[in-house]
C-alpha cells in the first residue's frame, strides 16, 4: 500500500474524534484443534476461543470459523504467539548418521483474506528450523505488527503442522488485534 | 471475559474522549536481581528499574516492589522480553552419553494479581527447551498481548531461573504496559 | 527518561484531543540489502521498503536512508522482526572436535539517533547464540516496546551480519513504529 500523506487539517476533517473504548479489539486463546480439510498448498488454520477466560471480542470485532472479522477500515496492530512442542525431529536422526539434511521447521503465518485480492495475503511469518537431538522440545514463535486493513477483511493464523501446537494453556498460544 | 457489544452511541456515553498523552504507561528495564525468597511452586518475580535510562512510568501507572500497578480499568497492551544466558545445559551432557532426557527449559510468565481473586492469573507464557551442546548460550523470549485489566490489578514478570537472566543491558530485558 | 507524573487536569491542558487516524505511523518491509560501509564497532543498518506491498508511512512519519524520522514528540511503540538464515555455524564444527567454544550469534538492535546526543542509543536488543549441527538453519528475532521519543529522533535497525538476513519476503523481516 502506498502510504497516504495528509496534512493534519485535511486528516482531522475525515477522522472524527472517538472514544478509545469504542474501538474494535480481540484477544483469542488456543483451544484443542479438530482436524479439518485444508488446501494442499496452504497451511491449516487454527481455530480459537473467543469468550472464555482471557479471550474476548468487543466493539463489532467478531470471531467466526477461524477468522477475526475486521469491522471498520483503519490501522490495526495484529499479533499472535504459537507455542510448538514435539519429539526429536527426523533431521537430527539423519544427522547423527553423519548426513546433513534440510532441517525440520515450524512456521506461523498471520494471513489476511480480502475480497479485492484473489489470493490470501501473508501479513506476518515466523519460521524456524528445528533440529533437536534426542529429546522432546518446545518453543514459541511470536509475531506482531501494524497493518492497514479494510472493513470486511478476515484474519487467520496458519501453522505448518497443527499436531505440534501446544493447546494446553491459554497463555501459551494466542491471537489478537486492535484498532489503533 | 464475554465480549461486550456496544452500539457506538452507548459506548461514547460511558467512554468520554480523552487525550492520549494522559493514559497510564510504563516501560521498565532490567536491573541486577537480588536473591529473594519465593514460594516453592511459583517462579520468582523480577524487579525493575522504573525511572533511569529508558525506563519510565507516567499518568498514575506506578511501579512498586516488582509490580506494575494498574491505575484505571481498560484494555492494556502488556509486553516483556527476557534475555537468558547460561552454560551448557545438563540435558546435553546426559544426551551425549546416549540417554534421551527431558530438556532443560527457560520460561517467562507475565502474571496478574487481583486482590479479589485468590490465585494469580498467568496472562502470557513463553517457554522454551534449551539443549545446547558444549558451550555458553543466550537467547531472548518475547511476549506481548492485549488484556482487559481492572483498576488495582498488579502485573509482574516471573522467570523459571533468575540466575539465568541477562541483567547487563536495559535493551535486552524489559517489561511494559500501556492503556489502549 | 524520568517518568513524568501529571495530574489528569494538568495533562489535559497540554495534550489536546486529536484524531487517531492523524498519528504518525510506519510499517517498513525488507528489501535486498546492498553492501555498505559501516563503522568497525557498529553493526550495519538495514534499509527498507516504505511504500510497496504491505509497507507504508503516513502522517509525517517519513523514511529516508535507513532511518525512520520521528515527526513529533510522544510515546511510540516500536517493533521489528528480522529473520536470519545460514549454513552450519563454525562453532558446531569446532564442537564436534570436542572443544567448547563461544557460539556464533545473531543480533538485532533497534537504535535511536538524536542530533543533540553524540552516541546512538540502543532501545531494543535481541541476541541469540546459534550452534546448529550439520544443516542450514533459519529463525526470527522479534522485538517491540514503547519509548518516549522526541521530534527529530531517527530510528534504525542494526544487525550483526547483513549477509544472514532473509530478504526474500516482506512478512519475514520488517520494522515499524506508531505514536500511541
Amino acid at each position: 500500500l502506498k502510504g497516504q500523506e495528509f496534512a493534519p487539517s485535511h486528516q482531522q476533517v475525515y477522522a472524527p474524534l472517538r472514544a478509545d473504548g469504542d474501538k474494535p479489539r480481540a484477544h483469542l486463546t488456543v483451544v484443542r484443534q479438530t482436524p479439518t480439510q485444508h488446501l494442499k498448498n496452504q497451511f491449516p488454520a487454527l481455530h480459537w476461543e473467543h469468550e472464555l477466560g482471557l479471550a474476548f471480542t468487543k466493539n463489532r470485532m467478531n470471531y467466526t470459523n477461524k477468522f477475526l472479522l475486521i469491522p471498520e477500515s483503519g490501522d490495526y496492530f495484529v499479533y499472535s504467539q504459537v507455542t510448538f512442542r514435539g519429539m526429536t525431529s527426523e533431521c537430527s536422526e539423519i544427522r547423527q548418521a553423519g548426513r546433513p539434511n534440510k532441517p525440520d521447521s515450524i512456521t506461523v503465518v498471520i494471513t489476511k483474506v480480502t475480497d479485492s485480492y484473489p489470493e490470501p495475503t501473508q501479513l506476518l511469518m515466523g519460521t524456524k528450523s528445528v533440529c533437536e537431538v534426542g529429546s522432546n522440545w518446545f518453543q514459541p514463535i511470536y509475531l506482531g505488527a501494524m497493518f492497514s486493513l479494510q472493513e470486511g477483511d478476515k484474519l487467520m493464523v496458519n501453522v505448518s503442522d497443527i499436531s505440534l501446537v501446544d493447546y494446553t494453556k491459554e497463555d501459551k498460544t494466542f491471537f489478537g488485534a486492535f484498532l489503533l | 471475559l464475554k465480549g461486550q457489544e456496544f452500539a457506538p452511541s452507548h459506548q461514547q456515553v460511558y467512554a468520554p474522549l480523552r487525550a492520549d498523552g494522559d493514559k497510564p504507561r510504563a516501560h521498565l528495564t532490567v536491573v541486577r536481581q537480588t536473591p529473594t525468597q519465593h514460594l516453592k511452586n511459583q517462579f520468582p518475580a523480577l524487579h525493575w528499574e522504573h525511572e533511569l535510562g529508558l525506563a519510565f512510568t507516567k499518568n498514575r501507572m506506578n511501579y512498586t516492589n516488582k509490580f506494575l500497578l494498574i491505575p484505571e480499568s481498560g484494555d492494556y497492551f502488556v509486553y516483556s522480553q527476557v534475555t537468558f544466558r547460561g552454560m551448557t545445559s545438563e540435558c546435553s551432557e546426559i544426551r551425549q552419553a546416549g540417554r534421551p532426557n527431558k530438556p532443560d527449559s527457560i520460561t517467562v510468565v507475565i502474571t496478574k494479581v487481583t486482590d479479589s481473586y485468590p490465585e494469580p492469573t498467568q496472562l502470557l507464557m513463553g517457554t522454551k527447551s534449551v539443549c545446547e551442546v558444549g558451550s555458553n548460550w543466550f537467547q531472548p523470549i518475547y511476549l506481548g498481548a492485549m488484556f482487559s485489566l481492572q483498576e488495582g490489578d498488579k502485573l509482574m514478570v516471573n522467570v523459571s531461573d533468575i540466575s539465568l537472566v541477562d541483567y547487563t543491558k536495559e535493551d535486552k530485558t524489559f517489561f511494559g504496559a500501556f492503556l489502549l | 527518561l524520568k517518568g513524568q507524573e501529571f495530574a489528569p487536569s494538568h495533562q489535559q491542558v497540554y495534550a489536546p484531543l486529536r484524531a487517531d487516524g492523524d498519528k504518525p505511523r510506519a510499517h517498513l518491509t525488507v528489501v535486498r540489502q546492498t553492501p555498505t560501509q559501516h563503522l568497525k564497532n557498529q553493526f550495519p543498518a538495514l534499509h527498507w521498503e516504505h511504500e510497496l506491498g504491505l509497507a507504508f508511512t503516513k502522517n509525517r512519519m517519513n523514511y529516508t536512508n535507513k532511518f525512520l524520522l520521528i515527526p513529533e514528540s510522544g510515546d511510540y511503540f516500536v517493533y521489528s522482526q528480522v529473520t536470519f538464515r545460514g549454513m552450519t555455524s563454525e562453532c558446531s564444527e569446532i564442537r564436534q572436535a570436542g572443544r567448547p567454544n563461544k557460539p556464533d550469534s545473531i543480533t538485532v538492535v533497534i537504535t535511536k539517533v538524536t542530533d543533540s546526543y553524540p552516541e546512538p542509543t540502543q532501545l531494543l536488543m535481541g541476541t541469540k547464540s546459534v550452534c546448529e549441527v550439520g544443516s542450514n538453519w533459519f529463525q526470527p528475532i522479534y522485538l517491540g516496546a514503547m519509548f518516549s521519543l522526541q521530534e527529530g529522533d531517527k530510528l534504525m535497525v542494526n544487525v550483526s551480519d547483513i549477509s544472514l538476513v532473509d530478504y526474500t519476503k516482506e512478512d519475514k523481516t520488517f520494522f515499524g513504529a506508531f505514536l500511541l
Partner: antibody, heavy 116, light 106 residues
Framework: QVQLQESGPGLVRPSQTLSLTCTVS????????MHWVRQRPGRGLEWMGR????????KYNPSLKSRVTITRDTSKNQVSLRLSSVTAADTAVYYC?????????WGQGSLVTVSS | DIQMTQSPSSLSASVGDRVTITCRAS?????MYWYQQKPGKAPKLLIY???NLASGVPSRFSGSGSGTDFTFTISSLQPEDIATYYC?????????FGQGTKVEIK
C-alpha cells in the same frame, strides 16, 4: 475441483421476486467471499453485491440496495440472491463468483427472463 | 460511483500484433483487475492487483498503471484471444466494470 453452480427459475413475472441459488463445491467457501454479478443482453457486467459466508456480512451495489438480498446457508454450502420487484430491465445472465481466499472462479451463469 | 472508461470499445488486429487497452477511473484507485469473456461463457480473471497474472494465464497478458490510468496488454495476439475484455475496480462501492473492449482478428 472448484465448482460454482447457479440454479433457479429461468422465467420470472414482473413485480415478482427473482431467486437464485449458487452451490459451491471443492473448497471451504467460508474462507472466501461470494459475489453476484449480472450481464444484461448486449450490455456489460454489473456487480450486484457480495457476502462473506463466514460472517454473513453483506455489501450491496447502492443502485440495487433497496431490492437485493444476499444470504448464505453454510450447512449446504450455498449462497442465495433475491431481487424484488423485478421488471423487464432485470432480464440478464446472473453469475455467482468467488474471490478472496483463492483465485477468482465464476459459475457458468443462469439466464433469467422477466416477462409476463 | 467510480466510473470506468475503457478504450477502445473495439479493435481488430492481426495474429502476433501487440494489443493495448486502456482504462481510466473517474477517481484514483489503488488496483485494477482485468477479465476476459468469450461469447456464451463466464468472465475469467486474467490480471489482479494491476499487474499480477492470475493462475494459469499465459504470460503474453500483462497489466500496468496507477492512480486513474491503467493499461492491459497482449504482447502477441493469438486466435484464442478473441473475446471481450473488461477492467474492474474494487475499491469504491459499488465495484464497477468498464464497458468492455471487443477484440477481433483481422
Amino acid at each position: 475441483q472448484v465448482q460454482l453452480q447457479e440454479s433457479g427459475p429461468g422465467l420470472v413475472r414482473p413485480s415478482q421476486t427473482l431467486s437464485l441459488t449458487c452451490t459451491v463445491s471443492g473448497f471451504d467457501y467460508q474462507d472466501t467471499y461470494m459475489h453476484w454479478v449480472r450481464q444484461r443482453p448486449g450490455r456489460g457486467l454489473e456487480w450486484m453485491g457480495r457476502i462473506d459466508p463466514a460472517s454473513g456480512h453483506t455489501k450491496y451495489n447502492p443502485s440495487l440496495k433497496s431490492r437485493v438480498t444476499i444470504t448464505r446457508d453454510t450447512s449446504k454450502n450455498q449462497v442465495s440472491l433475491r431481487l424484488s420487484s423485478v421488471t423487464a430491465a432485470d432480464t440478464a445472465v446472473y453469475y455467482c463468483a468467488v474471490s478472496g481466499g483463492m483465485p477468482d472462479v465464476w459459475g457458468q451463469g443462469s439466464l433469467v427472463t422477466v416477462s409476463s | 460511483d467510480i466510473q470506468m472508461t475503457q478504450s477502445p470499445s473495439s479493435l481488430s488486429a492481426s495474429v502476433g500484433d501487440r494489443v493495448t487497452i486502456t482504462c481510466r477511473a473517474s477517481q484514483g484507485v489503488e488496483y485494477m483487475y482485468w477479465y476476459q469473456q468469450k461469447p456464451g461463457k463466464a468472465p475469467k480473471l486474467l490480471i489482479y492487483a494491476t499487474s499480477n497474472l492470475a493462475s494459469g494465464v499465459p504470460s503474453r497478458f500483462s497489466g500496468s498503471g496507477s492512480g486513474t490510468d491503467f493499461t492491459f496488454t497482449i504482447s502477441s495476439l493469438q486466435p484464442e484471444d478473441i473475446a471481450t475484455y473488461y477492467c474492474q475496480q474494487w475499491e469504491g462501492n459499488p465495484r464497477t466494470f468498464g464497458q468492455g473492449t471487443k477484440v477481433e482478428i483481422k
